[in-house]
């Protein structure tokens, strides 16, 4: 899987969208690595 910063950002955006934004406050692109997915 792509693990560039931009890929991580887009994957996280998709995850936030699917979860309705109900995730931990520190779950942001600069805090999570690709392994978080």
């Amino acid at each position: 899987a792509c693990d560039t910063a931009t890929c991580v950002t887009h994957r996280l955006a998709g995850l936030l969208s699917r979860s309705g934004g109900v995730v931990k406050n520190n779950f942001v692109p600069t805090n999570v690595g690709s392994k978080a997915f």
Partner: antibody, heavy 119, light 107 residues
């Protein structure tokens, strides 16, 4: 609203250094990566690198590695790109850009900073 | 580095026309391609990410498709503000790379 505001145009001599700033507002600066992109006159776009404002981590394009340094000052939500040992082919517009998710999911770019290398 | 080749480099069209721009990658980049529109003297403006998703506020006349090595941007009905340069970018691998651009001119 999200904004990336860059420092003004610079004229610098060959061999010198330049430091361009990019002040972010309207979002949490440390949450999103900051990218830097070069556009020489009449040319295409060239990615320089990115910086993680949360921990200062960087990725650099090998073409610029050793001459470029990307840093941040989180206290003033500002990213910096310093380019050293300037040559005439460094004459270009330099952009900062960041993809945010909150408050809006978008790829924002600064207005650009023209750096002219001339003796 | 991944090379992105756009075609055509120049395109003449009229308001209301449907146009398609192609971006070919030298290696498989999955769906990890973005499209930008740039007007002279201005910063690029993001249109599409992940090959086919429009950013918020981008008109529905813009659509993207493709995966792997071949991608397309289609504008279904050209508006006056669409005459500009269109650029693809891959972000699947470092360093990110851009296509050379397609300049869309008024016929």
């Amino acid at each position: 609203q999200v904004q990336l505001v860059q420092s003004g145009a610079e004229v610098v001599k060959p061999g010198a250094s330049v430091k361009v700033s990019c002040k972010a507002s309207g979002y949490t600066f440390t949450d999103y990566y900051m990218n830097w992109v070069k556009q020489a006159p009449g040319q295409g776009l060239e990615w320089i690198g990115d910086v993680n404002p949360n921990n200062g981590g960087t990725h650099y394009n090998q073409k610029f590695k050793g001459r470029v340094t990307l840093t941040v000052d989180t206290s003033i939500s500002t990213a910096y790109m310093e380019l050293s040992r300037l040559r005439s082919d460094d004459t270009a517009v330099y952009y900062c850009a960041s993809i945010t998710i909150v408050p809006v999911y978008f790829d924002f770019w600064g207005q650009g900073t023209l750096v002219t290398v001339s003796s | 580095d991944i090379q992105l080749t756009q075609s055509p480099s120049f395109l003449s069209a009229s308001v209301g026309d449907r146009v398609t721009i192609t971006c070919k990658a030298s290696q498989n980049v999955g769906p990890n391609v973005a499209w930008y529109r740039q007007k002279p003297g201005k910063a690029p403006k993001a249109l599409i990410y992940s090959a086919s998703y429009r950013y918020s506020g981008v008109p529905s006349r813009f659509s993207g498709s493709g995966s792997g090595t071949e991608f397309t941007l289609t504008i279904s009905s050209l508006q006056p503000e669409d005459f500009a340069t269109y650029i693809c970018q891959q972000y699947n691998y470092y360093p990110y790379t851009f296509g050379q651009g397609t300049k869309l001119e008024i016929k």
